[in-house]
Protein backbone atom coordinates (compact mmCIF):
# COMPACT_ATOMS: atom_id res chain seq x y z
CA UNK A 1 0.00 0.00 0.00
CA UNK A 2 1.17 3.50 -0.85
CA UNK A 3 0.72 6.10 1.85
CA UNK A 4 -1.46 9.14 1.28
CA UNK A 5 -0.54 12.28 3.17
CA UNK A 6 -3.26 14.53 4.56
CA UNK A 7 -2.20 17.84 6.06
CA UNK A 8 -4.28 20.00 8.35
CA UNK A 9 -3.75 23.01 10.55
CA UNK A 10 -3.82 22.83 14.35
CA UNK A 11 -7.21 23.85 15.73
CA UNK A 12 -9.02 23.25 12.44
CA UNK A 13 -10.84 20.19 11.09
CA UNK A 14 -9.37 17.69 8.67
CA UNK A 15 -11.36 15.36 6.46
CA UNK A 16 -9.74 12.13 5.30
CA UNK A 17 -11.30 10.12 2.49
CA UNK A 18 -10.65 6.47 1.71
CA UNK A 19 -12.09 5.24 -1.60
CA UNK A 20 -12.80 1.52 -2.03
CA UNK A 21 -14.54 -0.98 -4.31
CA UNK A 22 -18.13 -0.94 -3.04
CA UNK A 23 -18.91 -4.38 -4.50
CA UNK A 24 -15.81 -6.08 -3.10
CA UNK A 25 -16.46 -4.65 0.36
CA UNK A 26 -20.25 -5.02 0.30
CA UNK A 27 -21.70 -5.74 3.74
CA UNK A 28 -18.46 -4.97 5.57
CA UNK A 29 -18.09 -2.52 8.43
CA UNK A 30 -15.14 -0.14 8.33
CA UNK A 31 -12.69 1.20 10.88
CA UNK A 32 -10.05 3.88 11.39
CA UNK A 33 -6.99 2.86 13.39
CA UNK A 34 -3.65 4.32 14.39
CA UNK A 35 -0.28 2.63 13.91
CA UNK A 36 1.67 3.37 17.07
CA UNK A 37 4.99 1.88 15.99
CA UNK A 38 6.83 0.07 13.22
CA UNK A 39 5.63 -3.22 14.62
CA UNK A 40 2.54 -4.03 16.61
CA UNK A 41 -1.16 -3.77 15.94
CA UNK A 42 -3.12 -0.86 14.56
CA UNK A 43 -5.00 0.66 17.50
CA UNK A 44 -8.70 1.14 16.73
CA UNK A 45 -9.88 4.73 17.02
CA UNK A 46 -13.43 4.51 15.70
CA UNK A 47 -15.55 2.14 13.59
CA UNK A 48 -18.75 2.47 11.59
CA UNK A 49 -22.19 1.55 12.91
CA UNK A 50 -22.67 -2.02 14.12
CA UNK A 51 -25.47 -2.37 11.57
CA UNK A 52 -23.91 -2.12 8.12
CA UNK A 53 -27.08 -0.58 6.64
CA UNK A 54 -26.66 2.31 9.06
CA UNK A 55 -23.01 2.92 8.12
CA UNK A 56 -23.97 6.33 6.73
CA UNK A 57 -24.65 7.53 10.28
CA UNK A 58 -21.72 9.47 11.65
CA UNK A 59 -20.10 7.87 14.70
CA UNK A 60 -17.81 9.80 17.03
CA UNK A 61 -15.05 8.80 19.37
CA UNK A 62 -13.81 11.97 21.05
CA UNK A 63 -12.89 14.39 18.27
CA UNK A 64 -12.81 11.74 15.51
CA UNK A 65 -15.85 10.87 13.39
CA UNK A 66 -16.43 8.18 10.76
CA UNK A 67 -19.10 7.79 8.11
CA UNK A 68 -19.36 5.39 5.17
CA UNK A 69 -20.95 5.91 1.78
CA UNK A 70 -21.39 2.21 1.02
CA UNK A 71 -22.91 2.78 -2.43
CA UNK A 72 -20.32 5.29 -3.60
CA UNK A 73 -17.50 3.41 -1.93
CA UNK A 74 -16.00 6.21 0.15
CA UNK A 75 -15.14 6.08 3.82
CA UNK A 76 -14.79 9.52 5.39
CA UNK A 77 -13.04 10.33 8.65
CA UNK A 78 -13.24 13.77 10.23
CA UNK A 79 -10.67 14.91 12.77
CA UNK A 80 -12.12 17.89 14.59
CA UNK A 81 -10.02 20.50 16.43
CA UNK A 82 -6.83 18.94 15.11
CA UNK A 83 -3.94 18.89 17.61
CA UNK A 84 -0.23 18.13 17.11
CA UNK A 85 -0.55 14.76 18.85
CA UNK A 86 -3.14 13.70 16.24
CA UNK A 87 -0.33 13.50 13.70
CA UNK A 88 0.64 9.96 12.83
CA UNK A 89 0.23 6.96 10.58
CA UNK A 90 -3.31 5.63 10.31
CA UNK A 91 -5.22 3.04 8.31
CA UNK A 92 -8.69 2.84 6.85
CA UNK A 93 -9.82 -0.75 7.28
CA UNK A 94 -12.53 -3.03 5.96
CA UNK A 95 -13.61 -5.54 8.60
CA UNK A 96 -14.66 -9.14 8.05
CA UNK A 97 -14.90 -11.38 11.08
CA UNK A 98 -11.79 -10.86 13.15
CA UNK A 99 -9.79 -9.90 10.04
CA UNK A 100 -9.19 -6.44 8.62
CA UNK A 101 -8.16 -5.42 5.10
CA UNK A 102 -6.27 -2.16 4.66
CA UNK A 103 -8.12 0.17 2.31
CA UNK A 104 -5.61 3.00 2.57
CA UNK A 105 -2.61 3.99 4.65
CA UNK A 106 -2.89 7.60 5.71
CA UNK A 107 -0.22 9.89 7.13
CA UNK A 108 -1.83 12.76 9.02
CA UNK A 109 0.34 15.85 9.44
CA UNK A 110 -0.64 18.70 11.74
CA UNK A 111 0.92 22.03 10.89
CA UNK A 112 1.23 25.00 13.22
CA UNK A 113 0.37 27.33 10.36
CA UNK A 114 -0.88 26.86 6.76
CA UNK A 115 2.30 28.52 5.50
CA UNK A 116 4.42 25.84 7.17
CA UNK A 117 3.76 23.61 4.18
CA UNK A 118 6.95 22.28 2.58
CA UNK A 119 6.21 24.28 -0.60
CA UNK A 120 5.33 27.37 1.38
CA UNK A 121 6.03 29.59 -1.62
CA UNK A 122 2.63 28.59 -2.97
CA UNK A 123 -0.57 29.30 -1.09
CA UNK A 124 -1.67 26.00 0.39
CA UNK A 125 -5.05 24.73 1.47
CA UNK A 126 -5.60 21.97 4.04
CA UNK A 127 -6.40 18.47 2.86
CA UNK A 128 -4.62 16.11 0.53
CA UNK A 129 -1.42 17.50 -0.94
CA UNK A 130 1.02 16.88 -3.77
CA UNK A 131 3.15 13.83 -4.41
CA UNK A 132 6.32 12.73 -2.59
CA UNK A 133 8.31 9.72 -3.77
CA UNK A 134 6.49 6.70 -2.34
CA UNK A 135 3.90 8.81 -0.53
CA UNK A 136 0.90 9.80 -2.59
CA UNK A 137 -0.66 13.14 -1.82
CA UNK A 138 -3.39 14.98 -3.70
CA UNK A 139 -4.96 18.44 -3.50
Amino acid sequence: HNTTVFQGVAGQSLQVSCPYDSMKHWGRRKAWCRQLGEKGPCQRVVSTHNLWLLSFLRRWNGSTAITDDTLGGTLTITLRNLQPHDAGLYQCQSLHGSEADTLRKVLVEVLADPLDHRDAGDLWFPGESESFEDAHVEH
Partner: antibody, heavy 121, light 107 residues
Amino acid sequence: ELQLQESGPVLVKPGASVKMSCKASGYTFTDYYMNWVKQSHGKSLEWIGVINPYTGATSYNQKFKGKATLTVDKSSSTAYMELNSLTSEDSAVYYCARGTYYSNYEGFPYWGQGTLVTVSA
Amino acid sequence: DIQMTQSPSSLSASLGERVSLTCRASQEISGYLSWLQQKPDGTIKRLIYAASTLDSGVPKRFSGSRSGSDYSLTISSLESEDFADYYCLQYASYPYTFGGGTKLEIK
Protein backbone atom coordinates in the same frame (compact mmCIF):
# COMPACT_ATOMS: atom_id res chain seq x y z
CA GLU B 1 21.93 1.55 19.51
CA LEU B 2 19.93 4.69 18.78
CA GLN B 3 22.11 7.79 18.44
CA LEU B 4 21.67 11.44 17.52
CA GLN B 5 25.11 12.84 16.77
CA GLU B 6 25.18 16.62 16.55
CA SER B 7 27.88 18.70 14.86
CA GLY B 8 30.61 20.39 16.88
CA PRO B 9 30.73 23.84 18.49
CA VAL B 10 30.94 26.88 16.23
CA LEU B 11 32.04 30.47 16.63
CA VAL B 12 30.38 32.81 14.13
CA LYS B 13 30.32 36.53 13.47
CA PRO B 14 27.19 38.66 13.90
CA GLY B 15 25.12 38.79 10.71
CA ALA B 16 26.42 35.45 9.46
CA SER B 17 24.54 32.16 9.11
CA VAL B 18 25.26 28.74 10.56
CA LYS B 19 24.02 25.29 9.58
CA MET B 20 24.24 22.54 12.18
CA SER B 21 23.56 18.85 11.72
CA CYS B 22 22.08 15.94 13.62
CA LYS B 23 23.00 12.52 12.25
CA ALA B 24 20.60 9.77 13.26
CA SER B 25 21.44 6.09 13.52
CA GLY B 26 19.94 2.96 15.03
CA TYR B 27 16.40 3.48 13.70
CA THR B 28 14.47 4.24 10.50
CA PHE B 29 15.13 7.96 10.09
CA THR B 30 12.03 8.75 8.01
CA ASP B 31 9.63 7.16 10.51
CA TYR B 32 10.19 9.63 13.34
CA TYR B 33 9.76 13.37 13.72
CA MET B 34 12.80 15.48 14.52
CA ASN B 35 12.54 18.53 16.79
CA TRP B 36 15.01 21.31 17.51
CA VAL B 37 15.33 23.02 20.88
CA LYS B 38 17.33 26.06 22.03
CA GLN B 39 18.92 26.57 25.44
CA SER B 40 20.51 29.92 26.14
CA HIS B 41 23.21 29.93 28.83
CA GLY B 42 21.70 29.36 32.28
CA LYS B 43 18.17 29.46 30.89
CA SER B 44 15.34 27.07 30.18
CA LEU B 45 14.57 25.28 26.92
CA GLU B 46 12.68 26.67 23.93
CA TRP B 47 11.12 24.61 21.15
CA ILE B 48 12.16 25.91 17.72
CA GLY B 49 10.29 23.61 15.41
CA VAL B 50 9.75 20.12 14.04
CA ILE B 51 10.26 18.37 10.73
CA ASN B 52 8.74 15.17 9.38
CA PRO B 53 11.70 13.57 7.56
CA TYR B 54 9.34 11.46 5.43
CA THR B 55 7.67 14.41 3.71
CA GLY B 56 9.82 17.37 4.70
CA ALA B 57 6.80 19.12 6.25
CA THR B 58 7.73 21.54 9.02
CA SER B 59 6.07 23.46 11.83
CA TYR B 60 7.82 26.31 13.59
CA ASN B 61 7.47 28.21 16.80
CA GLN B 62 6.36 31.66 15.58
CA LYS B 63 9.26 33.17 17.54
CA PHE B 64 11.80 31.37 15.31
CA LYS B 65 10.07 31.85 11.95
CA GLY B 66 12.47 33.52 9.58
CA LYS B 67 15.36 32.75 11.94
CA ALA B 68 15.52 28.94 11.65
CA THR B 69 15.12 26.66 8.63
CA LEU B 70 14.76 22.91 9.14
CA THR B 71 15.69 20.40 6.43
CA VAL B 72 16.68 16.75 6.14
CA ASP B 73 18.85 14.60 3.91
CA LYS B 74 17.18 11.20 3.85
CA SER B 75 20.10 9.52 2.09
CA SER B 76 22.43 10.25 5.02
CA SER B 77 19.75 10.15 7.77
CA THR B 78 20.71 13.66 8.79
CA ALA B 79 18.58 16.56 9.98
CA TYR B 80 19.81 20.12 9.60
CA MET B 81 18.97 23.47 11.12
CA GLU B 82 20.17 26.71 9.58
CA LEU B 83 20.11 29.93 11.58
CA ASN B 84 20.48 33.22 9.74
CA SER B 85 21.26 36.87 10.56
CA LEU B 86 22.92 35.81 13.77
CA THR B 87 23.10 38.10 16.79
CA SER B 88 24.38 37.60 20.35
CA GLU B 89 20.82 36.51 21.25
CA ASP B 90 21.38 33.39 19.14
CA SER B 91 24.36 32.28 21.24
CA ALA B 92 23.09 29.07 22.82
CA VAL B 93 23.22 25.30 22.84
CA TYR B 94 20.92 23.78 20.21
CA TYR B 95 19.57 20.26 20.59
CA CYS B 96 17.93 17.92 18.14
CA ALA B 97 15.34 15.68 19.79
CA ARG B 98 13.62 12.74 18.14
CA GLY B 99 9.86 12.52 18.35
CA THR B 100 7.66 9.44 18.22
CA TYR B 101 6.35 7.41 15.29
CA TYR B 102 5.31 9.94 12.60
CA SER B 103 4.35 12.28 15.43
CA ASN B 104 5.25 13.79 18.80
CA TYR B 105 2.39 12.10 20.67
CA GLU B 106 4.75 10.95 23.43
CA GLY B 107 7.05 13.97 23.45
CA PHE B 108 10.78 13.68 22.73
CA PRO B 109 12.24 10.35 23.88
CA TYR B 110 15.78 10.84 22.54
CA TRP B 111 18.06 13.86 22.54
CA GLY B 112 21.32 14.77 20.84
CA GLN B 113 24.26 16.01 22.89
CA GLY B 114 23.77 19.61 21.72
CA THR B 115 25.70 22.04 19.52
CA LEU B 116 27.14 25.17 21.09
CA VAL B 117 26.82 28.23 18.89
CA THR B 118 28.71 31.36 19.97
CA VAL B 119 28.07 34.61 18.13
CA SER B 120 30.89 37.08 18.61
CA ALA B 121 32.76 39.67 16.59
CA ASP C 1 0.97 29.92 23.94
CA ILE C 2 0.62 27.60 26.90
CA GLN C 3 2.67 28.74 29.89
CA MET C 4 4.24 26.05 32.04
CA THR C 5 4.97 27.40 35.51
CA GLN C 6 7.47 25.17 37.25
CA SER C 7 8.22 25.24 40.97
CA PRO C 8 10.41 25.40 42.87
CA SER C 9 13.12 26.95 40.69
CA SER C 10 15.75 25.45 42.97
CA LEU C 11 15.72 22.87 45.72
CA SER C 12 18.33 21.64 48.19
CA ALA C 13 17.77 18.15 49.51
CA SER C 14 19.62 15.30 51.16
CA LEU C 15 20.32 11.78 49.96
CA GLY C 16 17.38 9.49 50.71
CA GLU C 17 14.93 12.41 50.91
CA ARG C 18 11.62 12.46 49.03
CA VAL C 19 11.11 15.48 46.77
CA SER C 20 8.36 16.72 44.47
CA LEU C 21 8.52 19.21 41.59
CA THR C 22 5.42 20.75 40.06
CA CYS C 23 4.40 22.23 36.73
CA ARG C 24 1.15 24.12 36.27
CA ALA C 25 -0.28 24.49 32.76
CA SER C 26 -2.03 27.75 31.86
CA GLN C 27 -4.41 25.84 29.56
CA GLU C 28 -5.67 22.28 29.28
CA ILE C 29 -2.92 19.91 28.10
CA SER C 30 -4.80 16.63 28.68
CA GLY C 31 -1.81 14.79 30.12
CA TYR C 32 0.48 15.53 27.17
CA LEU C 33 3.38 16.28 29.48
CA SER C 34 6.83 14.83 29.98
CA TRP C 35 9.60 15.32 32.51
CA LEU C 36 13.21 15.71 31.42
CA GLN C 37 16.45 15.47 33.36
CA GLN C 38 19.49 17.51 32.33
CA LYS C 39 22.88 16.60 33.77
CA PRO C 40 25.66 19.20 34.28
CA ASP C 41 27.36 18.07 31.04
CA GLY C 42 24.21 19.09 29.14
CA THR C 43 22.92 15.56 28.50
CA ILE C 44 19.11 15.45 28.40
CA LYS C 45 17.09 12.34 29.19
CA ARG C 46 13.33 11.85 29.20
CA LEU C 47 12.11 10.33 32.46
CA ILE C 48 8.33 10.37 32.12
CA TYR C 49 5.80 10.92 29.32
CA ALA C 50 2.01 11.10 29.18
CA ALA C 51 2.20 12.67 32.68
CA SER C 52 2.80 9.39 34.50
CA THR C 53 4.37 6.77 32.21
CA LEU C 54 7.92 5.91 33.24
CA ASP C 55 10.48 5.59 30.45
CA SER C 56 12.14 2.23 30.14
CA GLY C 57 15.37 2.07 32.10
CA VAL C 58 14.33 4.89 34.45
CA PRO C 59 14.52 3.89 38.15
CA LYS C 60 11.18 3.30 39.86
CA ARG C 61 11.94 5.95 42.47
CA PHE C 62 10.76 8.45 39.82
CA SER C 63 7.02 8.87 39.36
CA GLY C 64 4.71 11.33 37.67
CA SER C 65 1.17 12.35 38.57
CA ARG C 66 -1.53 14.82 37.65
CA SER C 67 -4.11 16.76 39.60
CA GLY C 68 -6.15 18.99 37.31
CA SER C 69 -3.73 21.40 35.65
CA ASP C 70 -0.94 20.57 38.10
CA TYR C 71 1.62 17.95 37.12
CA SER C 72 4.17 16.56 39.55
CA LEU C 73 7.42 14.66 39.40
CA THR C 74 8.30 12.83 42.61
CA ILE C 75 11.59 11.20 43.50
CA SER C 76 10.87 8.87 46.42
CA SER C 77 14.42 8.54 47.75
CA LEU C 78 17.14 10.76 46.31
CA GLU C 79 20.34 9.18 45.05
CA SER C 80 23.55 11.04 44.15
CA GLU C 81 22.97 10.77 40.39
CA ASP C 82 19.58 12.53 40.74
CA PHE C 83 21.13 15.91 41.45
CA ALA C 84 20.51 17.70 38.16
CA ASP C 85 18.16 20.14 36.42
CA TYR C 86 14.59 19.04 35.69
CA TYR C 87 12.17 20.42 33.11
CA CYS C 88 8.58 19.72 32.21
CA LEU C 89 7.47 19.85 28.57
CA GLN C 90 3.93 20.17 27.25
CA TYR C 91 3.39 18.71 23.80
CA ALA C 92 -0.38 19.15 23.65
CA SER C 93 -0.34 22.15 21.34
CA TYR C 94 1.95 24.34 19.27
CA PRO C 95 4.26 25.85 20.20
CA TYR C 96 5.49 23.19 22.58
CA THR C 97 6.63 24.84 25.79
CA PHE C 98 8.90 23.97 28.70
CA GLY C 99 8.78 24.86 32.36
CA GLY C 100 11.45 27.21 33.69
CA GLY C 101 13.33 24.32 35.26
CA THR C 102 14.20 23.15 38.75
CA LYS C 103 17.79 22.93 39.93
CA LEU C 104 18.04 20.05 42.39
CA GLU C 105 21.13 20.43 44.58
CA ILE C 106 22.72 18.40 47.35
CA LYS C 107 22.18 19.82 50.83
